[in-house]
């Protein structure tokens, strides 16, 4: 019971945090006009990974898209890389999920790869969590380089003889959503890991049953059967060996006797 | 079609009050007050937001005059305290449009401060 | 604050004539989020309200006739009727429209020769 609040909780916080995620990369408001001591401006621009918007007083807005590629910062493009390498694996990550709730129940899946394909989308999360924070993360540094920056300008003039208006950028909204959903996403990946542990089944002891035929003593052992079909004690071990190396496929396969050599 | 009308000007003595209306009709986001004293140039006053509420002043009328909205008589306001001789002048509201501009005005009216 | 100066503060010309007249602003009115700057004018006629001519320091408001034309970016900008017409005998005025508080050139009385 515990192990399905488990993973059904890290399934809802990743769920949440990949929504988060997704909202994050698609807001314009990644970095925001400083507005110094002054709340009311009359021109105000913001800027996202995909676009940058003005609103006016008027209450006018309008954005424009960066319509090219080789022409933007390096490190804008990493943090678009990073962002939707988050959503890819995260996406993916919610398929796999799915399959492997212990509530939901797809033909004669076994719990063997029900841990597995869990295992797999925890490792999922947590990387589209890093990536989504690492991302946030990078811009946030590259805005606060840019702040001192242009910080410092603003008080070296051009010989004073023109006063220019430096806009200062500082942290947006999308920054705190992304590190939040990051966060979440995260912590949904390291739930649904500590579910596949409780998900794998454990090993169970069979006592050796001795039958004694006669002029033959021959004793069977029940592990021989179980070791071809994949429910033998070997398969406990085997999941700790290889369970997160395995793809979507395999997971979802049944095992066969190629599979514990 | 904003059609915009202001009222309440006249005849004030110094150190008087006085409150300017302005009625509004259409979409409006934000307007101004900006007075035009006699034979002199324009001078912006104030300016708030229709939604919000949120007011800027210029910096000769800070603490003496206070723009604010009606939202269900769909009224701008000029508040105007302590009032000077320097403040005669025809007072107009303004609507802020795109690029901020001001694209419909209002037809204008008179204050007089004199004793 | 942004102070703008306008020039000339009062100039004769004839039907048909080219006006120019210029506004200097003190700080930079470009706006680098959307590169553009914002700087409007206005005409007025004795006893009447002003009329938007030009806001974003080029674009024609709408029903303004094309022979009002704005240029210029930065702190300098132009207003240019290119033939004047009867009906364009009036004052003109350059607006910050970039921060607040707003403020207004001291305007450009167009007179009749």
């Known amino acids: 019971m515990a192990v399905t609040a488990c993973q059904g909780l890290g399934f809802v916080v990743s769920l949440i945090g990949i929504a988060g995620i997704i909202a994050a990369t698609c807001m314009d408001q990644w970095s925001t006009q400083d507005l110094y001591n002054n709340p009311v401006t009359a021109v105000f621009n913001y800027q996202g990974l995909w676009r940058s918007c003005v609103r006016e007083s008027s209450g006018f807005t309008e954005c424009r898209g960066y319509f090219t590629l080789l022409g933007l910062p390096a490190m804008l493009q990493a943090v678009r890389a990073l962002m939707i390498v988050g959503i890819v694996l995260g996406a993916i990550g919610l398929l796999v999920s799915i399959f492997a709730l212990k509530c939901i129940r797809i033909g004669s899946m076994e719990d063997s790869a029900k841990a597995n394909m869990t295992l797999t989308s925890g490792i999922m999360f947590i990387v589209s969590g890093l990536c989504a924070i690492a991302g946030v993360s990078v811009f946030a540094n590259m805005l606060v380089t840019n702040f001192w920056m242009s910080t410092a300008n603003m008080y070296t003039g051009m010989g004073g003889m023109v006063q220019t208006v430096q806009t200062r950028y500082t942290f947006g909204a999308a920054l705190f959503v992304g590190w939040v959903a990051g966060g979440l996403t995260l912590i949904g990946g390291v739930m649904m890991c500590i579910a596949c542990r409780g998900l794998a089944p454990e090993e169970t002891n069979y006592k050796a049953v001795s039958y004694h035929a006669s002029g033959h003593s021959v004793a069977y052992k029940p592990g021989g059967f179980k070791a071809s079909t994949g429910f033998g004690s070997n398969t406990k071990n085997k999941k700790i060996y290889d369970g997160g190396a395995r793809t979507e496929d395999e997971v979802q396969s049944y095992p066969s006797k190629h599979d514990y050599v | 079609e904003v059609q915009l009308v202001e009222s309440g000007g006249g005849l004030v003595q110094p150190g008087g009050s006085l409150r300017l209306s302005c009625a509004v009709s259409g979409y409006t986001f934000s307007m101004n007050w900006v007075r035009q004293a006699p034979g002199k140039g324009l001078e912006w006053v104030a300016w708030i937001n229709m939604y919000t509420g949120e007011p800027t002043y210029a910096d000769d009328f800070k603490g003496r005059f206070t723009i604010s909205r009606d939202d269900s008589k769909n009224t701008l306001y000029l508040q105007m305290n302590s009032l000077r001789a320097e403040d005669t002048a025809v007072y107009y509201c303004?609507?802020?449009?795109?690029?901020?501009?001001?694209?419909?005005w209002g037809q204008g009216t008179l204050v007089t401060v004199s004793s | 604050d942004i102070q703008m100066t306008q020039s000339p503060s009062s100039l004769s010309a004839s039907v048909g004539d080219r006006v120019t007249i210029t506004c200097k602003s003190s700080?930079?009115?470009?706006?680098?989020?959307?590169?553009?700057?914002?700087l409007t004018w206005y005409q007025q006629k004795p006893g009447k309200a002003p009329k938007l001519l030009i806001y974003?320091?080029?674009t024609l408001e709408s029903g303004v006739p094309s022979r009002f034309s704005g240029s210029g970016s930065g702190t300098d900008y132009t207003l240019t009727i290119s033939s004047l017409q009867p009906e364009d005998f009036a004052t003109y005025y350059c607006?910050?429209?970039?921060?607040?508080?707003?403020?207004f050139g001291q305007g450009t009385k167009v007179e009749i020769k």
């Open positions: 700080q930079s009115l470009l706006n680098s989020g959307n590169q553009k700057s914002y």
């Open positions: 303004a609507r802020t449009s795109r690029g901020n501009g001001m694209d419909y």
């Open positions: 974003w320091a080029s």
């Open positions: 607006q910050n429209a970039y921060s607040f508080p707003f403020t």
